[in-house]
């Protein structure tokens, strides 16, 4: 049986935290790190659809970023494999109501953290 901390939501052996507050991309990742988590890594269409369903009407940062002229990478350093399109010309990715887009790192948005669930 999988379990997640209070205020976290479980889906397919992962736990997700949807923020109430807004922060820039860097501060959002710092928060996730403080919870032994990272900004969300989206590994399947099912996971993407789950996040889109649960995030509500606000944009939410996820754990994808890129250096200028470089490919998108997840927080753990693995390259993004183009599972879904990312619109926009920003360096950090977020989820909107239809999918993923990108914006400058200093803009403030809600965020989603993810980590492996706890098996009990």
């Amino acid at each position: 049986q999988a379990a997640c901390p209070e205020s976290w939501i479980g889906f397919q052996r992962k736990c997700f935290y949807f923020s109430d507050d807004t922060k820039n991309w860097t501060s959002s990742q710092r928060f996730c790190d403080s919870q032994d988590a990272d900004l969300a890594q989206v590994e399947s269409f099912q996971e993407l659809n789950f996040l889109l369903r649960y995030k509500g009407p606000s944009d939410h940062w996820i754990g994808l970023s890129r250096e200028q002229g470089q490919p998108w990478k997840w927080i753990n350093g693995t390259e993004w494999t183009r599972q879904f399109p990312i619109l926009g010309a920003g360096e950090c990715a977020y989820l909107n109501d239809k999918g993923a887009s990108s914006a400058r790192h200093y803009t403030e948005r809600k965020w989603i953290c993810s980590k492996s669930d706890i098996h009990v």
Partner: antibody, heavy 121, light 107 residues
């Protein structure tokens, strides 16, 4: 179709609290594909979003920075409605107040009839 | 907070003409979260366009939205007498903000 019916007083004294209610028919306040908002309109400030409540496995509230310290929006699942409370009002809070539905990614598609609220002694 | 600036403030045209209304955002807005509304005196705003370019239910096809990033446009082809009103743009991706409005009046 979805309809929103507003109720509440049209006159409030300065420093008191403004309270309005919005009754929902044709949808649920607990819907996981909608958010329920309060928006106001005045000649001086134009259309101004005040805040919203919505349910996604738990209840969330988002408030505009301009009113964050004195606003509360609450859902009432038993009556399928949501309410606005704005504390410490001043004449600058005089406006037409609207309750609205934001339907997932489809914009603010349903508006209440509007309530003209005057703040005056 | 994203600021939306609409231009022109007032647009004077005749029925049958084309109206082009502009909305510029202070920072990039997700195209999925940009809407246009029409408001007539004494009425609540009415949703015309959502997702920058999708027409709301019951909206005639002479109303068209376009744009992305920071620049968005509402075009009304073949103006009808009932189209003369005030038009607002709105972003709803990160809280919500409205433009100050464009008044479309009969020339």
């Amino acid at each position: 179709q979805v309809q929103l019916q507003q109720s509440g007083p049209g006159l409030v004294k300065p420093s008191q609290s403004l309270s309005l209610t919005c009754a929902i028919s044709g949808d649920s306040v607990s819907s996981n594909s909608a958010a329920w908002n309060w928006i106001r309109q005045s000649p001086s400030r134009g259309l101004e979003w005040l805040g919203r409540t919505y349910y996604r496995s738990k209840w969330y509230n988002d408030y505009a920075v301009s009113v964050k310290s004195r606003i509360t929006i609450k859902p009432d699942t038993s009556k399928n409605q949501f309410s606005l409370q704005l504390n410490s009002v001043t004449p600058e809070d005089t406006a037409v107040y609207y309750c609205t539905r934001l339907a997932n990614s489809d914009g603010v598609d349903v508006w209440g009839q509007g309530t003209m609220v005057t703040v005056s002694s | 907070e994203t600021t939306l600036t609409q231009s022109p403030g007032t647009l004077s045209l005749s029925p049958g003409e084309r109206a082009t209304l502009s909305c510029r955002a202070s920072q990039s807005v997700s195209s999925n979260s940009l809407a246009w509304y029409q408001q007539k005196p004494g009425q609540a705003p009415r949703l015309l366009i959502y997702g920058a370019s999708s027409r709301a239910s019951g909206i005639p096809d002479r109303f068209n939205g376009s744009g992305s990033g920071t620049d968005f446009t509402l075009t009304i082809n073949r103006l009808e007498p009932e189209d003369f009103a005030v038009y607002y743009c709105q972003q709803y991706g990160n809280s919500q903000t409205f433009g100050q409005g464009t008044r479309l009046e009969i020339k």
